[in-house]
């Protein structure tokens, strides 16, 4: 691994440790299950695709930051505070990419059946651009997908 | 629009050093990666690695590990390569490409022209 | 390493179909991209996200993937469509970017 990258990993990592993800999980929870409240919990009805073009922040500009401002109305208290955690990440991308990676870590055992964790994926992937924040390049959200050999 | 120019073609003796640029416009230049792709003659596309202008992070292919350097100037909006030792084997068009895409999705709609690099005694 | 094969070449006689293939371990789990390049020029993108065709591009021109296979099918092929293919993923394991072989496209 290169010199740049152990140094970023530290600094990431302390950064991660101070951060408070709590409010985002919090958020992210509940934004899932006020939807499937308001769609029923029929797991045969037409389920949006998750990359489907309405859904996926890349059929935007992808570093063009939500137009509304972060404390809108509807959004909730969770949603602010979760806001200003991510904040501190916008200058360093990959440690983004490792705070959201930790949320849906955190969250994968209390998702109920692949419908769920789809949906809070998608969610998840919307949650930079709703805090007027950058989406991260390179970032695998797949918790299956294990530990990353970078480089 | 969105333009990369990159420097003209180059001619180099084995074992010397070669320098390609790839100066940008039409678009934020630290807001997106710049990543190096070459193609050697009749041959298909190898990518070589990438730079976060923002950062100066990068990330090189196992393959040119010790002997790439990207870097970038973003008072000019322009990525560099440089590649070190070389041999007839690099003989090899470079391209630079921008990235695009979030998350998972990571590809390139934005190439420069190609700068041919020949390789010979 | 992620390694993307792809057919050195495919012929197809104009009016008639091209299917392109990228083969690789579980591909259905990755983002697949393609790229057509003529010669003497850069790549284009054709395809971005296993399906999202490019404005420039044809509806003719498709992407589709399942199990260990991505296609990129081209319908009532033209002569214009006479190129090389790539494909192209983000391999997110070593954080690495992998073209396949490329597929030269011959308009019979």
């Known amino acids: 691994r290169q010199q740049w990258e152990l140094q970023g990993d530290r600094r990431c990592q302390s950064q991660l440790e101070r951060a408070n993800l709590r409010p985002c999980e919090q958020h992210l929870m509940q934004k899932i299950q006020r939807d499937e409240d308001s769609y029923g919990r029929d797991p045969y009805s037409p389920s949006q695709d998750p990359y489907s073009p309405s859904q996926d922040p890349d059929r935007r500009d992808p570093y063009s930051p939500s137009p509304y401002d972060r404390r809108g109305a509807g959004s909730s208290q969770h949603q602010e505070r979760c806001c200003n955690e991510l904040n501190e990440f916008e200058n360093n991308q990959r440690c983004m990419c490792e705070a959201l990676q930790q949320i849906m870590e955190n969250q994968s055992d209390r998702l109920q059946g692949r419908q769920q964790e789809q949906q809070f994926k998608r969610e998840l992937r919307n949650l930079p651009q709703q805090c007027g924040l950058r989406a991260p390049q390179r970032c695998d959200l797949e918790v299956e997908s294990g530990g990353r050999d970078r480089y | 629009q969105v333009q990369l120019v990159q420097s003209g073609p180059e001619v180099r003796k084995p074992g010397a050093s070669v320098r390609v640029s790839c100066t940008t416009s039409?678009?934020?230049?630290?807001?997106?990666?710049m990543n190096w792709v070459r193609q050697a003659p009749g041959q298909g596309l190898e990518w070589m690695g990438l730079?976060?202008?923002?950062?100066?992070?990068?990330g090189y292919a196992q393959k040119f590990q010790d002997r790439v350097t990207m870097t970038s100037d973003t008072s000019l909006s322009t990525a560099y390569l440089e590649l070190s030792g070389l041999t007839s084997e690099d003989t090899a068009v470079y391209y630079c490409?921008?990235?695009?895409?979030?998350?998972?999705?990571?590809?390139?709609?934005?190439w420069g022209q190609g700068s041919l690099v020949t390789v010979s005694s | 390493s992620y390694v993307l094969t792809q057919p050195p070449s495919v012929s197809v006689a104009p009016g008639k179909t091209a299917s392109i293939t990228c083969e690789a371990k579980n591909i259905v789990r990755k983002r697949v991209h393609w790229y057509r390049q003529k010669p003497g020029q850069a790549p284009v993108v054709v395809v971005s996200d296993d399906e999202d065709r490019s404005s420039v591009i044809p509806e003719r021109v498709s992407g589709s993937k399942s199990g260990d296979t991505a296609t990129l099918t081209i319908s009532r092929v033209e002569a214009g469509d006479e190129a090389d293919y790539y494909c192209?993923?983000?391999?997110?394991?070593?954080?690495?970017?992998?073209f396949g072989g490329g597929t030269k496209v011959t308009v019979l």
């Open positions: 730079i976060n202008p923002h950062s100066g992070d990068t």
């Open positions: 490409a921008r990235s695009q895409g979030t998350f998972e999705v990571y590809y390139f709609v934005s």
């Open positions: 192209q993923v983000w391999d997110s394991t070593t954080d690495q970017v992998v």
């Open positions: 039409g678009y934020t230049f630290i807001d997106y990666e």
